[in-house]
Interface confidence: low
């Protein structure tokens, strides 16, 4: 074992941690669970207690971020560098923090709690055998209820345990229905939907209404993320994968590999992979927050890394079932804070405690519980009137859409967001964008298919900005943004993850505010935004007003372009020039003639 | 004008190391990211990696995980690539390209001959 | 071997049209938009074009690109003797940048 230089520990034994945030990846109770493990590793063997607070005075905050996340030592997206933590000390000593960007679970793939069936409620084990096939997923296979359900065991051949997998065909969360399964087909605005739907509304939440007709009833509920099945990457990130499903003309019930050269699983988020072409990766096995916060809160204790393979504290992740502390790991410690001055107890169970399980029988009705993994900022109000038809089928590429005069960008009245991206300016509208140069005497190019480009975005966007040093791209719809790198996604994520708190419906636009920093509007507020750390200042909030005067209170979109702020409201636009820290409106025009240069015919 | 200036060429034993420079000029260099691409003789252009001026962040390609590293000094602003273990199926032009939309300056290439 | 499939050849006369295929599969072309690359003999490669369709300023009008589904095409509307040389597509296959095999251009 090796200590940081000066043996650096705790000068007392009650050590505090608090969690400061979530991971999605996992229900909050098996994070907590988690961590309260790995702690109860360590006070097994030496004198220390650990106990979990709700403040930052604590000595050990727990955090889950990505990339820069505010102490300089940033994460490195998903693999490579898992978690890291800082020796003990004040301040950000002590500290653990989780790169968010990993799949997060129990080591052996998605932790996907169960209800009914006869497991009492203990989560899916993936991959499982059933009928000599294995599944690396839900299946609905051997039901002819459409219900997804998995074994709770690796073979369920031989063990006949299994539970239901969230389903929106079993229950609901949230909304107006009681948890009410839903129902389909149902009608919304006049269409009909079987299935989930995020139209209506604004912030990418998927609903769907548990009576025959939304447009009579008014009743609705949030249909349940499925964890095991929601794919990453592809062109249809944060999508189910469908199984059965059609490639190459052969049907695939689980995800596969066939087609890619790298031997990655991925599925199709339709039937048909041959005719649609929308896919994604399946999640892997996840790294095993279990294990990971053990070694992490080794090094928060005082311990560095060890030599010894076989020890936790050695660099590099290995899944194990077996008991985590090596003979060197307690030697390590106990240099350091000495043994437990009682008998050793019993090592502690890890099992992650179950929420009881109804009736072992196949449900006929929906659970009256609410999920308690539900976003706390999540949706609570009816679908709020939007689009009224599905979104324009198209080609899978970034190919123009048959021009017709509702797809002139001089034809739109007002654009759901504008942002300045490369030298471009780009103007989006309901699922399509068209892009526009200036000087060139040509009209907007396009419109192209949101989908082709960014195709984890919804149709409907607030506001979009590109941060020039780093080229990721923000956009934003209700309560969530999408952070694209090139071809990569992070996202969705949920404003709170930004700083942002609840009462903030909306992003309705940013400006640049010095290198690394930019400005976001929210209505008549702003604030003061850290693009590296991706976090608001709370203490920067300030009146749009306050700081440009002038400008119409009301605007739905704000955006940069040739280094000056665009306030727009209704077709019209307020441009804000900066000349020695004045703000001031010196244009308003009409964003159609006076940006876009388009004909006044 | 903008421009890359790779380091001069380069004759190597099998297992050796390389280390290829690239100082860019006339634009900013923490505004784009570095791409490094080789073309063994004869044949076609291979991704090897590509780098953020900006933060540092790197992503490699597959093939050379383990053996490639890319950093940047922004206070020369210029790019590095270091490839460990040569074999002789390494010899190739090594190109640096700034990298944004597409590859769209690129140096004017480093021959590394690895060679017993 | 190559992951986006070029034809290895193809040539025409001066003024004739030149179309450059470069087939991919939905994991590259089909999700993201392909840029093209000319590369004279001894000389480094040159963006020629991006986004499946823009020219670099300098870039003559000749050149234009389009992407349909799983393939991208490059055409030279009037071919110049003065663009023999090599041609390379390249898109994203999730993380990582891929290029086509190359298509040698002959102008007769």
């Known amino acids: 074992f090796q200590t940081f230089e000066g043996d650096l520990k705790w000068h007392h034994h009650n050590i505090t941690y608090w969690i400061q945030n979530y991971s999605e990846d996992l229900p909050r109770a098996v994070i907590d669970d988690a961590f309260a493990r790995a702690f109860a590793l360590w006070s097994a063997v030496t004198p220390l207690t650990f106990t979990r607070v709700y403040s930052r005075d604590a000595d050990i905050v727990i955090q889950f971020g990505v990339a820069e996340h505010g102490d300089g030592y940033p994460f490195d997206g998903k693999d490579g560098l898992l978690a890291h933590a800082f020796p003990p000390g004040p301040g950000i000593q002590g500290d653990a923090h989780f790169d968010d960007d990993e799949l997060w679970s129990l080591g052996k793939g998605v932790v996907v709690p169960t209800r009914f069936g006869n497991a009492d409620g203990a989560a899916c084990h993936f991959p499982f055998i059933f009928e000599g096939r294995s599944y690396s997923a839900c299946t609905t296979d051997g039901r002819s209820d459409g219900l997804p359900w998995c074994s709770t065991t690796a073979n369920y051949d031989t063990d006949d345990r299994f539970g239901f997998c969230p389903s929106e065909r079993l229950y609901t969360q949230d909304g107006n229905a009681d948890g009410k399964p839903c129902q389909f087909p149902f009608i919304f605005q006049g269409q009909s939907y079987s299935a989930c739907t995020t139209d209506g509304r604004s912030d990418g939440y998927r609903w769907c209404a548990t009576t025959a007709n939304y447009d009579r009833d008014k009743l609705f509920g949030f249909c349940p993320t499925r964890a095991d099945s929601t794919v990453m990457g592809g062109n249809s990130a944060g999508e189910l994968c469908v199984f059965p499903f059609t490639f190459l003309g052969k049907e695939y019930s689980t995800c596969t590999s066939e087609g890619r050269g790298d031997g990655r699983l991925w599925c199709a988020t339709t039937s048909n992979f041959d005719s649609d072409k929308k896919w994604g990766f399946c999640p892997d096995q996840g790294y095993s927050l279990f294990l990971v916060a053990a070694h992490e809160f080794g090094h928060a204790l005082g311990l560095d890394h060890s030599s010894v393979p076989e020890a936790l504290m050695y660099p590099m992740y290995r899944f194990t079932e077996g008991p985590p502390l090596h003979k060197d790991d307690v030697n390590g410690i106990r240099h350091l804070y000495g043994p437990r001055p009682e008998p050793e107890p019993r090592p502690p169970t890890t099992t992650t405690p179950q929420p009881t399980a109804p009736p072992t029988v196949c449900p006929t009705g929906p659970p009256t519980v609410h999920p308690s993994e539900r976003p706390t900022a999540g949706p609570t109000g009816p679908p709020s009137a939007g689009p009224t038809g599905p979104p324009t089928a198209g080609p899978s590429t970034a190919t123009t859409v048959p021009l017709s005069p509702v797809d002139d960008a001089c034809n739109v009245n007002i654009f759901d967001a504008i942002a300045e991206i490369g030298n471009q300016l780009y103007l989006f509208k309901d699922g399509k964008y068209w892009r526009f140069s200036e000087g060139r005497g040509s009209r907007p190019q396009g419109p192209f298919l949101i989908a082709d480009k960014w195709p984890a975005l919804p149709r409907k966007l607030d506001s979009v900005f590109e941060e020039r040093l780093s080229k990721k791209l923000f956009f934003f719809s209700g309560r969530q943004v999408w952070v694209y790198t090139g071809a990569s996604v992070l996202g969705p994520r949920r404003l709170d993850k930004l700083g942002l708190g609840a009462d903030v419906a909306q992003v309705t636009g940013a400006l640049r505010s010095g290198r690394g920093k930019m400005l976001l509007f929210s209505g008549r507020r702003l604030w003061r935004f850290d693009v590296k750390a991706q976090m608001v200042d709370p203490r920067s909030a300030s009146e749009v007003d306050r700081m440009f005067p002038g400008v119409p209170l009301d605007t739905h979109d704000v955006f940069q372009y040739r280094e000056k702020a665009y306030f727009c409201q209704d077709r019209f636009y307020w441009r804000v020039s900066s000349r020695s820290e004045l703000n001031q409106v010196d244009q308003v025009g009409y964003v159609t003639y006076d940006i876009l240069q388009c004909p006044e015919d | 004008q903008v421009q890359l200036v790779e380091s001069g060429a380069e004759v190597k034993k099998p297992g050796a190391s390389v280390k290829v420079s690239c100082k860019a000029s006339?634009?900013?260099?923490?505004?784009?990211?570095i791409s490094w691409v080789r073309q063994a003789p004869g044949q076609g252009l291979e991704w090897m990696g590509w780098?953020?001026?900006?933060?540092?962040?790197?992503n490699y390609a597959q093939k050379l995980q383990g053996r490639v590293t890319m950093t940047t000094d922004t206070s020369t602003n210029t790019a590095h690539m270091e490839l460990r273990s040569l074999r002789s199926d390494d010899t190739a032009v090594y190109y640096c390209?700034?990298?944004?939309?597409?590859?769209?300056?690129w140096g004017q290439g480093t021959t590394v001959t690895v060679s017993s | 071997q190559a992951v986006l499939t070029q034809p290895p050849s193809t040539s025409g006369t001066p003024g004739q049209r030149v179309t450059i295929s470069c087939s991919g599969s939905?994991?590259?072309?089909?999700?993201?938009?392909v840029n093209w690359y000319q590369q004279l003999p001894g000389t480094a490669p040159k963006l020629l074009i991006y986004?499946?369709?823009h020219r670099p300023s300098g870039v003559p009008d000749r050149f234009s690109g389009s992407n349909s589904w799983n393939t991208a095409t490059l055409t030279i509307s009037r071919v110049e003797v003065g663009d023999e040389g090599d041609y390379y597509c390249?898109?994203?296959?999730?993380?990582?940048?891929?290029f086509g095999g190359g298509t040698k251009v002959t102008v007769l």
């Open positions: 390209a700034r990298d944004y939309y597409g590859m769209d300056v």
């Open positions: 006339g634009y900013t260099f923490t505004s784009y990211g």
């Open positions: 780098i953020s001026a900006y933060n540092g962040n790197t």
């Open positions: 939905t994991f590259n072309i089909g999700s993201n938009t």
């Open positions: 986004s499946d369709s």
């Open positions: 390249q898109a994203w296959d999730s993380s990582a940048v891929v």
